[in-house]
């Protein structure tokens, strides 16, 4: 009954803070609208990164200013995090919900810790 | 901090109907998706209602369906709870919840009582 | 739907003792969607645990859950007299979302 949703469990951020992870979902029925929100859970607090609804077959649409950018492909959520820091360094967890048609399921992910390092900065040349 | 407020309970008779509201404040409504709960004199809880972030998307038990309709105005940060119908069986503490990040009702209001009887 | 049972209906300990309920579902639950909530007489529910075993925030750490599949239990390792109310299982990870009758944690 339960929903399972997958991700990987470490992600190394590029130098540029680009992070990309799949959110890969059971689906126990035919949903038509998919709602997929990234969390960030730190010192046991969590709070949302990101979110869109998407209908199935049509791409994921995140607001102008989110830090996310998406792709879907049935079951599976390609998901990219931009602008991260060292310190945004955390677990971002992957939540599922089939919205449309009932009944309604929810799949939480393990989360995927993403590690984040600041580049160096370039030494000046003469 | 997060408060969920309910109002519109009282004393109503049999058939009639009966308008719950739910003011909420301290956190982004819209980006929540909310519940009904009630829970019968001396009874346990019981799901009544649920609304997706946007109220496009409603659930309903199957004891109120056809009868309860639940609304949500994200500008006003206000959900409502349309009840028509009434049943004596209808009588209790009605609940307005906030669902959580992970799922779990995490916020609950006081409650509003409901009573219908002749 | 998930039919969520409690047992037993009501638990007469003494402060300080330890308090074991039990919450059985009809099918399979994930444990990432099943709470316990705790209710005291003219108050609001108030959450305790999600997920099975994490606490919420504010929860002291006498309160645990565990549990998988299709039996989860709550334990109270010393009860305080703040304790004493009822307590109520949860799933949330389908609709309609479900309750189990509750458990009465009363004073001996």
């Known amino acids: 009954k339960a929903m399972h949703v997958a991700q990987p469990a470490v992600v190394l951020a590029s130098s540029r803070g680009i992070a990309s992870f799949v959110c890969e979902y059971a689906s126990p029925g035919k949903a038509t609208e998919v709602r997929v929100t990234v969390l960030r859970q730190a010192d046991s607090q969590v709070t949302e990164v990101c979110a869109a609804t998407y209908m199935m077959g049509n791409e994921l649409t995140f607001l102008d200013d989110s830090i996310c950018t998406g792709t879907s492909s049935g079951n599976q959520v390609n998901l990219t995090i931009q602008g991260l820091r060292a310190m945004d360094t955390g677990l971002y967890i992957c939540k599922v919900e089939l919205m449309y048609p009932p009944p309604y399921y929810l799949g939480i992910g393990n989360g995927t810790q993403i590690y984040v390092i600041d580049p160096e900065p370039c030494p000046d040349s003469d | 901090q997060v408060q969920l407020v309910e109002s519109g309970g009282g004393v109503v008779q049999p058939g009639r109907s009966l308008r719950l509201s739910c003011a909420a404040s301290?956190?982004?409504?819209?980006?929540?998706?909310m519940h009904w709960v009630r829970q019968a004199p001396g009874k346990g809880l019981e799901w009544v209602t649920f609304?997706?972030?946007?109220?496009?998307?409603?659930y309903y038990a199957d004891s109120v369906k056809g009868r309860f309709t639940i609304s949500r105005d994200n500008s006003k940060n206000t959900l409502t709870l349309e009840m028509n119908s009434l049943t004596p069986e209808d009588t209790a503490i009605y609940y307005c919840?906030?669902?959580?990040?992970?799922?779990?009702?995490?916020?609950w209001g006081q409650g509003t009582l409901v009573t219908v009887s002749s | 739907e998930i039919v969520l049972t409690q047992s037993p209906g009501t638990l007469s300990l003494s402060p300080g003792e330890r308090a074991t309920l039990s919450c059985r579902a009809s099918?399979?639950?994930?444990?990432?969607?099943l709470a316990w909530y705790q209710q005291k007489p003219g108050q609001a529910p108030r959450l305790l645990i999600y997920?099975?075993?994490s606490r919420a925030t504010g929860i002291p750490d006498r309160f645990s859950g565990s549990g998988s599949g299709t039996d989860f239990t709550l334990t109270i390792s010393r009860l305080e007299p703040e304790d004493f109310a009822v307590y109520y299982c949860?799933?949330?990870?389908?609709?309609?979302?479900?309750f189990g009758q509750g458990t009465k944690v009363e004073i001996k």
């Open positions: 919840a906030r669902t959580g990040w992970l799922g779990p009702f995490d916020y």
């Open positions: 301290g956190f982004t409504f819209s980006s929540y998706t």
């Open positions: 609304i997706s972030y946007d109220g496009n998307n409603k």
């Open positions: 099918q399979s639950v994930g444990s990432s969607y």
């Open positions: 997920g099975a075993f």
């Open positions: 949860q799933q949330y990870g389908s609709s309609p979302w479900t």
